[in-house]
């Protein structure tokens, strides 16, 4: 089974919808506020990011044995990142320059997890984040630190789908 | 355009609660957090709390905590705030701020508590 | 909470003259200072915000400096229509507070 219900998820929509994910990720990170970081110092908001480890099934054995464990893993890491970019980190001050495609990533990431699990679907989603108001001091690093390691993930998520669209695509 | 506005003026007695209203247009009502601040009159500025629309998460001025109350709809594009136990110290302008580094404000609601 | 101190309370000056309102704060605040002008029965408007960035629709007769605990805001010839109150706030930490404000009056 690959998602809930024992279908194969869309890997080609998957792959496109992933590498766009790349693009905007890397894109976004310079552009997350007013100026540029100063004296703020290591912050231990983002410790807890969720990583797609060697236990996850996401290599290539694994995903032909059974993609379902992968995938979930890489859903729960989409909703972890869909809820940080919707956090006050976010959405508070400073606000995000006019030109910042922090708001398509955001949109694109719910887009990728719902391809992932379709409505009526659910799987369970682990490691969200439960945030407490940032101070507007520490948003700009906490958003520099977030969108680092949302590249890191949405990277290994684009190589697991273009896998699956070479590989597992029926 | 951006645009917040804010429902009419208020008149209640000491003792009731009052929920005021900041309706939101010309943007997407979840991309900002949504400040609230109270003047007295002829008094200064004062930050009650802000709502992140969002996700409703709220962070309050101590100060406020438990007088103040913030919520939104999104589907209304709403942001409101009550006020409870109300007395004379809580008769003032009430104003809604989109992001303090944005140039938008409500036009405020007055809110006078008198027997 | 972080105190901001504004001074003078009232300036009193005459159309042209170039005017300086200063704020302090009781600590550090980088330059996470927003001024606001406020007219009388009016919503306050966003004048300079991070201590010197202009706001776009405000005249360049406005401008900010400073960083740290000590700004200043800089209208270089007032008009009539600048009177009001001007408050500085910090934007730096929680919670956020302004400073009791400077009414600017013309002779």
């Known amino acids: 089974r690959a998602v809930p219900g024992g279908s194969s998820p869309a890997w080609t929509q998957c792959q496109q919808l992933s590498q766009k994910l790349c693009t905007l990720a890397w894109s976004a990170h310079p552009l997350v506020g007013h100026m540029d970081l100063r004296e703020e110092g290591d912050e231990e908001t983002t410790n807890d990011v969720p990583h797609i480890q060697c236990g996850d099934g996401c290599d290539p054995q694994g995903l032909r044995d059974n993609s379902q464990f992968c995938l979930q893993r890489i859903h729960q890491g989409l909703i972890f990142y869909e809820k940080l970019l919707g956090s006050d980190i976010f959405t508070g001050e400073p606000s995000l320059l006019p030109d910042s495609p922090v708001g398509q990533l955001h949109a694109s990431l719910l887009g990728l997890s719902q391809l992932l699990q379709p409505e009526g679907h659910h799987w369970e989603t682990q490691q969200i984040p439960s945030l407490s108001p940032s101070q507007p001091w520490q948003r700009l690093l906490l958003r520099f630190k977030i969108l680092r390691s949302l590249q890191a993930f949405v990277a290994v998520a684009a190589r697991v789908f273009a896998h699956g669209a070479a590989t597992l695509s029926p | 355009e951006v645009q917040l506005q804010q429902s009419g003026p208020e008149l209640v007695k000491p003792g009731a609660s009052v929920k005021m209203s900041c309706k939101a247009s010309?943007?997407?009502?979840?991309?900002?957090?949504m400040h609230w601040v109270k003047q007295k009159p002829g008094q200064g500025l004062e930050w009650i709390g802000y709502i992140n629309p969002y996700n409703d998460g709220t962070k309050y001025n101590e100060k406020f905590k438990g007088k103040a109350t913030l919520t939104s709809d999104k589907s209304s594009s709403t942001a409101y705030m009550e006020l409870s136990s109300l007395t004379s110290e809580d008769s003032a302008v009430y104003y809604c701020a989109r992001r303090w580094d944005e140039a938008y404000w409500g036009q405020g609601t007055l809110v006078t508590v008198s027997a | 909470d972080i105190v901001m101190t504004q001074s003078p309370a009232t300036l009193s000056v005459t159309p042209g003259d170039r005017v300086s309102l200063s704020c302090r704060a009781s600590?550090?605040?980088?330059?996470?200072l927003h001024w606001y002008q406020q007219r009388s029965h009016e919503s306050p408007r966003l004048l300079i915000k991070y201590a010197s960035q202009s706001i776009s629709g405000i005249p360049s007769r406005f401008s900010g400096s400073g960083s740290g605990s000590d700004f200043t805001l800089t209208i270089n010839s007032v008009e009539p229509e600048d009177v009001g109150v001007y408050y500085c706030q910090n934007g730096h930490s929680f919670p956020f507070t302004f400073g009791s404000g400077t009414k600017l009056e013309i002779k």
């Open positions: 010309g943007y997407t009502f979840t991309c900002c957090i």
């Open positions: 600590q550090s605040i980088s330059d996470y």
